[in-house]
């Protein structure tokens, strides 16, 4: 066979679909690899060919488009399953070609099983809701293109195993689920089941997402440095270990990069010659506010080190703050034999 531009196995597109449900899978060539769309390719006389390799097999085989009730079909650049079966799992390839041109890409398709509470190995999208922020909605995802706009599906919403009927603060409204005031107790997995008719058959689409209630932007503040502070003095003798924690609280902010760093005499620790180590730990509250702690450590501190300026800095989308640690050299307790004796005029 003549040469074909092979984009390999596109593992970035790990497609997961539920067993016994319809699935429509677009050929990734037009979305990620080529600079033209299917219509342009088709107009130019290019043909889209599909084939697959079953799970745990090496043999590429054509897809059987002659199954009863057209269970698998192709429409433009979409491969349709009506519905999927567990053994449809495998690597699927779409190839665009004519006599002079060829390009192909493979992608993995995994058909997964769900339990009665919609648990499955499927990776779930996470939707963040702001706590006590007013009405917020989640929308049943990835159902476009399954049925025409003339078809009115029925949509049922569940939290875990249980159907959501109008409840104090969670209200199903067709494709949307409205949270009047989101609370921590609303955290969990929410599932919409979309049921629609097609050619005398009834199909179900199941879509689950995780709702995570997070801190509201109304309550967000610039970073707060809890340590170092004015109440703690790091008093050390030369040769001792100096440990200074920088503990910073960050309000949850969507897509904000939280940063903490130390400067020593105005320079980053990497840019100076002292043997200093920095260890960082991060913890989160239930609403994803973040506390970062960076511990600056100098194993054997020198009297020079104890004269330096140690400043903790923090930055988020809400602002930047800094706080200097109070570091000083401990005055050694007098040794009687020398200092006190001298004080008493002994020679």
């Amino acid at each position: 066979s003549e040469r074909c531009d092979d984009w390999g196995l596109d593992t970035m597109r790990q497609i997961q679909v539920f067993e016994d449900e319809p699935a429509r899978i677009k050929c990734p060539l037009f979305e990620h690899f080529l600079k033209f769309n299917y219509s342009t390719a088709h107009s130019a006389g290019l043909t889209l060919i599909w084939y697959w390799t079953r799970q745990d097999r090496d043999l590429e085989e054509p897809i059987n488009f002659r199954l009863p009730e057209n269970r698998i079909s192709k429409e433009k650049d979409v491969l349709w399953f009506r519905p999927t079966l567990l053994n449809d799992t495998g690597n699927y390839t779409c190839m665009l070609r004519n006599t002079t041109y060829c390009s192909k890409v493979a992608f993995p398709l995994e058909v997964v099983q769900k339990d009665s509470c919609f648990n499955s190995p499927m990776k779930l999208p996470v939707h963040k809701l702001y706590i006590e922020y007013g009405i917020q909605r989640i929308t049943c995802p990835n159902v476009d293109g399954y049925f025409p706009s003339s078809v009115k599906p029925t949509i049922t919403w569940y939290m875990g195993c249980y159907k959501i009927q109008n409840f104090n603060n969670v209200i199903p409204e067709g494709m949307n689920l409205s949270f009047l005031i989101a609370l921590i107790s609303n955290n969990g997995n929410y599932t919409c089941v979309v049921t629609y008719p097609e050619n005398g058959r009834t199909f179900h689409l199941t879509r689950t997402l995780t709702v995570k209630v997070v801190g509201s932007p109304k309550n967000a503040v610039p970073p707060v440095i809890h340590s170092p502070n004015d109440h703690v003095v790091y008093e050390k003798e030369p040769g001792e270990e100096l440990l200074i924690p920088c503990t910073v609280y960050f309000s949850f902010l969507m897509d904000s990069r939280n940063e903490v760093w130390w400067t020593i005499d105005g320079k980053k620790p990497d840019d100076i010659t002292i043997d200093v180590t920095i260890n960082e730990s991060i913890s989160h509250s239930r609403t994803e506010d973040e506390t970062r702690t960076q511990i600056l450590s100098i194993k054997k501190v020198t009297s020079e080190d104890l004269k330096r300026s140690y400043v903790c800095h923090a930055r988020s989308a809400k602002g930047e703050v800094a706080k200097a640690a109070k570091v000083k050299q401990k005055v050694p307790a007098p040794r009687y034999t020398v200092e006190l004796a001298c004080g008493f005029g002994a020679t």
Epitope: D115, S116, C117, N119, G160, C161, I164, F167
Partner: antibody
Framework: QVQLVQSGAEVKKPGSSVKVSCKAS????????ISWVRQAPGQGLEWMGG????????NYAQKFQGRVTITADESTSTAYMELSSLRSEDTAVYYC????????????WGQGTLVTVSS | EIVLTQSPATLSLSPGERATLSCRAS??????LAWYQQKPGQAPRLLIY???NRATGIPARFSGSGSGTDFTLTISSLEPEDFAVYYC?????????FGQGTKVEIK
């Protein structure tokens, strides 16, 4: 620690109803669901249905549909199971058990309530 | 509804021996299966969920395996307190169903 405490034993006449309660403590009631499972003398376990503590919606086994009603009172952290039109074969120990809203396994169980149906 | 068949009905073993209990489903339940232990006069206790995950506080001698229709609960070395009835339960489809139980008794 989590505890589910059920109401005491009941003796009922055929055709009557029984309502068993299950009070939860040591956890956030609204974060969980409560299922009811029964066990006839010397027999295995039979799942009857369950309820979401937060939404108050229930799932029932087809076998009990129309005869069992499961409710939950979030204010008292208590779930109830009412079984009507009792017959002698309903004589069993009735257990309540807790599970996460999206879990199919029952992680904490009540001590059980013996319901005897006899004329 | 899905029928779970446990075997054997009774298993007679001595302390220290290995116990292997089987649970077969009438159709695939993937890995949506749990195991429980029940002692006389007590409520069941969750041992294993998701076919192979040990519940909190369950000793390492208990292990679960299997997927689809065939599942196994193994007790690597029986302790005196392990003699009880064991039930499997599926949650793949409504209604949730239990096996009829396997009694592990002292030989």
């Amino acid at each position: 620690q989590v505890q589910l405490v059920q109401s005491g034993a009941e003796v009922k006449k055929p055709g009557s109803s029984v309502k068993v309660s299950c009070k939860a403590s040591g956890g956030t009631f609204s974060s969980y669901a409560i299922s009811w499972v029964r066990q006839a003398p010397g027999q295995g376990l039979e799942w009857m249905g369950g309820i979401s503590a937060i939404f108050g919606t229930a799932n029932y086994a087809q076998k009990f549909q129309g005869r069992v009603t499961i409710t939950a009172d979030e204010s008292t952290s208590t779930a109830y199971m009412e079984l009507s039109s009792l017959r002698s074969e309903d004589t069993a120990v009735y257990y309540c058990a807790r599970h996460l809203h999206n879990a199919i396994h029952l992680d904490y169980w009540g001590q059980g309530t013996l319901v005897t149906v006899s004329s | 509804e899905i029928v779970l068949t446990q075997s054997p009905a009774t298993l007679s073993l001595s302390p220290g021996e290995r116990a292997t209990l089987s649970c077969r489903a009438s159709q695939s339940v993937s890995n949506f299966l749990a195991w429980y232990q029940q002692k006389p006069g007590q409520a069941p206790r969750l041992l294993i969920y998701g076919a192979s995950n040990r519940a909190t506080g369950i000793p390492a001698r208990f292990s679960g395996s299997g997927s689809g229709t065939d599942f196994t609960l193994t007790i690597s070395s029986l302790e005196p307190e392990d003699f009880a009835v064991y039930y499997c339960q599926q949650g793949k489809h409504w209604p949730w169903t239990f096996g009829q139980g396997t009694k592990v008794e002292i030989k």
